[in-house]
Amino acid sequence: AIVFIKQPSSQDALQGRRALLRCEVEAPGLVHVYWLLDGAPVQDTERRFTQGSSLSFAAVDRLQDSGTFQCVARDDVTGEEARSANASFNIKWIEAGPVVLKHPASEAEIQPQTQVTLRCHIDGHPRPTYQWFRDGTPLSDGQSNNTVSSKERNLTLRPAGPEHSGLYSCCAHNAFGQACSSQNFTLSIADESFARVVLAPQDVIVARNEEAMFHCQFSAQPPPNLQWLFEDETPITNRSRPPHLRRATVFANGSLLLTQVRPRNAGVYRCIGQGQRGPPVILEATLHLAEIEDMPLFEPRVFTAGSEERVTCLPPKGLPEPSVWWEHAGVRLPTHGRVYQKGHELVLASIAESDAGVYTCHAANLAGQRRQDVNITVATVPTWLKKPQDSQLEEGKPGYLHCLTQATPKPTVVWYRNQMLISEDSRFEVFKNGTLRINNVEVYDGTWYRCVSSTPAGSIEAQARVQVLEKLKFTPPPQPQQCMEFDKEATVPCSATGREKPTIKWERADGSSLPEWVTDNAGTLHFARVTRDDAGNYTCIASNGPQGQIRAHVQLTVAVFITFKVEPERTTVYQGHTALLQCEAQGDPKPLIQWKGKDRILDPTKLGPRMHIFQNGSLVIHDVAPEDSGRYTCIAGNSCNIKHTEAPLYVVDKPVPEESEGPGSPPPYKMIQT
């Protein structure tokens, strides 16, 4: 048997919102579940579709979903069928509509003292509650001789009089929400004695010193009074004109004329009509002084031939709004063609080189005229004047590669070296004409170079190979002064490169031959055991066929390298006592001693009274303080050699002797006591 585990149940739903009718079945065999609406099968749509066995609504529709839904489960093998309980939606909705005249039948039949009934066509479920408004102000039952029936959605005015004139609107709300009338009703009930507008003044824009005219007429029985006021409520009459309206004239027909308008005349003018009965009718019009601001500058524009381009002219701010037009070569552009004006835009369709030039945007109104030029360049693809060529450049000298092109606008040239963009630095310089200068050619500059010349219209490129002609040079140049340690083995290297591999030899500067214990092995001068006599001037000579020879002079000094006879020791001193840091070094030439304390060299000429460096190199510090603590370095150096040794200095407080300690008790650490 087919059993419903979940049955659909009737429920509230909201128009346009999601909803779900639930259905779940259990059966021994395979069952096919479908839905009925008022007995007819429900077809799946994007809005309403089956989800499992349930029926899902993406947006409930009060018209398409009204009725009775039923879930049907059918066993297609046995033919057994089960139907769920009926379920329906209580759909809540609200829909806006217009305010319409219900009585009398037409507006033409509305007369003073007749009954007027308006109907609010807002519908909804549950039945909405209505609220009426006149000129935006809520109306309540019994207010000013009208009867409001919000339940019946009607507003009855009995009897209707001129005081009921106005714009009638309605709003309604229910459980779904709120809606207001889509179209409102203007009720106009005339009273002959009320002032009625015949001619209303219009806003006026005039140029300075021009004249402005405002027309204003009212009608009523008996004829109404008419009065003009300006801005600050100052009345304007032919007898009493305010100082700033000396040139104002009020005509018998109600028109107001202002001559030779000045900025102070600009503002709001009120024309007031007062009938024998009823409220005053106030009409306003504004007098604006015409003005026009300057136009913003155009950036020069570069376009490519064959393309379509537009240039927008932003009109300057102005009153009245300025009219805009484009001119080229003194001729106004047409509104169609290949080069034409469309709105505020200059349109160039399928640009030709001949379109280049100055185009002018003009703007004008009552206040005057403004103009602004835009320079349009039509870009062309560059052409060659001089391509880069394969070149041999000399090492150490400046080298040039040319890339001369012409185009409109002036092309930009970039260079690549081994496919890498060359950025200008101290060695590379790209001239305005596109030439690349290599300031100091180096061996590794021998590679491929490519130049690319571009404009917005396109680009051209060419490449060239650079071969570097290597100069004859020492690599590296020998140090001009070198030291050798006495009685030790020593070598002095010398190497060179050139376009051809150079031969290298050493000789003594005085021309004498090298002793037998000194050998010249492929440019390396080798001393088996250095003697005092080996000191002197030597020359390294490098030569090849095409480039000749070069020489490097070296002065060799023989020295006994520095050793320390006495080195400073780790020292601890009581505060206020004297510290002695000993240092003595030997070597040839005789070494000089310098001290470094707290990471700075101690200058003997600026030591002050507490410090002193003795002839033998020892450092003495009197009246030591805690800030003297630190690492002290003894540096011994001569023209050939430099050595250093260091020791820490600790400054400590002198302990107060305890009673148990005898006068001769030793301190707890090694001390210098003075």
């Epitope: 149940s9 429920q11 779900l20 209580n90």
Partner: antibody, heavy 119, light 107 residues
């Protein structure tokens, strides 16, 4: 992870208005209704209304129609409720909650915003 | 509006006991009832939807039953962490409404 983050506590004077927010994260904001509920101290919950973040269309409990205005800002995945003409009766904890697809039950809740109306 | 009446207002049980909360609707609402737990100073948490459907992440000791107008929430074996207020909510008619709640206390 679905999260609703309510704005901090508010202390306002009678007659004033207040706008509280609820920032959603961890799911597609426009796919689910955001509901607003009121719980006065020691009392049960009252449903104020809900809003469809996709269309911005609210539905109100009639009781709160003149009191609450529901809005959303899709760009910041944030729902707002403005309460106006406040009185001491409006002092409560206000929750935002995300419903299931149909908006019939509330499976994710904000931590609540405490509103105190006092002179 | 549909009125949901929860009874009793307070339930006092010992840990391990079985407990049932009742919720009665003022009219037939099918199975459109949902149950929530709210611990002190916390936000409500959905326990059961559509009268009997379980919610992922909710312990299996919570179950729901009923249709039409009478509904129940059952905790099979009460634990100390179940101390809270329990509310039912209907989604059959607008506006959606909640019951007055039942407070669960541990003896």
């Amino acid at each position: 992870e679905v999260q609703l983050l309510s704005s901090g506590p508010e202390l306002v004077t009678p007659g004033a208005s207040v706008k509280i927010s609820c920032k959603a994260s961890g799911y597609t904001f426009t796919d689910y209704y955001i509901n607003w509920l009121k719980q006065s101290h020691g009392k049960s919950l009252e449903w104020i209304g809900d809003i469809n973040p996709n269309s911005g269309g609210p539905v109100y409990n009639q009781k709160f129609m003149a009191k609450a205005t529901l809005t959303v800002d899709k760009t910041s995945n944030t729902a707002y409720m403005e309460l106006r003409s406040l009185t001491s009766e409006d002092s409560a904890v206000y929750y935002c909650a995300r419903g299931d697809y149909y908006g019939s039950n509330y499976n994710y809740w904000g931590q609540g915003t405490t509103l105190t109306v006092s002179s | 509006d549909i009125l949901l009446t929860q009874s009793p207002a307070i339930l006092s049980v010992s840990p391990g006991e079985r407990v049932s909360f009742s919720c009665r609707a003022s009219q037939n609402i099918g199975t459109s009832i949902h149950w929530y737990q709210q611990r002190t100073n916390g936000s409500p948490r959905l326990l059961i939807k559509f009268a009997s459907e379980s919610i992922s992440g909710i312990p299996s000791r919570f179950s729901g039953s009923g249709s039409g107008t009478d509904f129940a929430l059952t905790i099979n074996s009460v634990e100390s962490e179940d101390i809270a207020d329990y509310y039912c909510q209907q989604s059959n008619n607008w506006p959606y409404t909640f019951g007055g709640g039942t407070k669960l206390e541990i003896k």
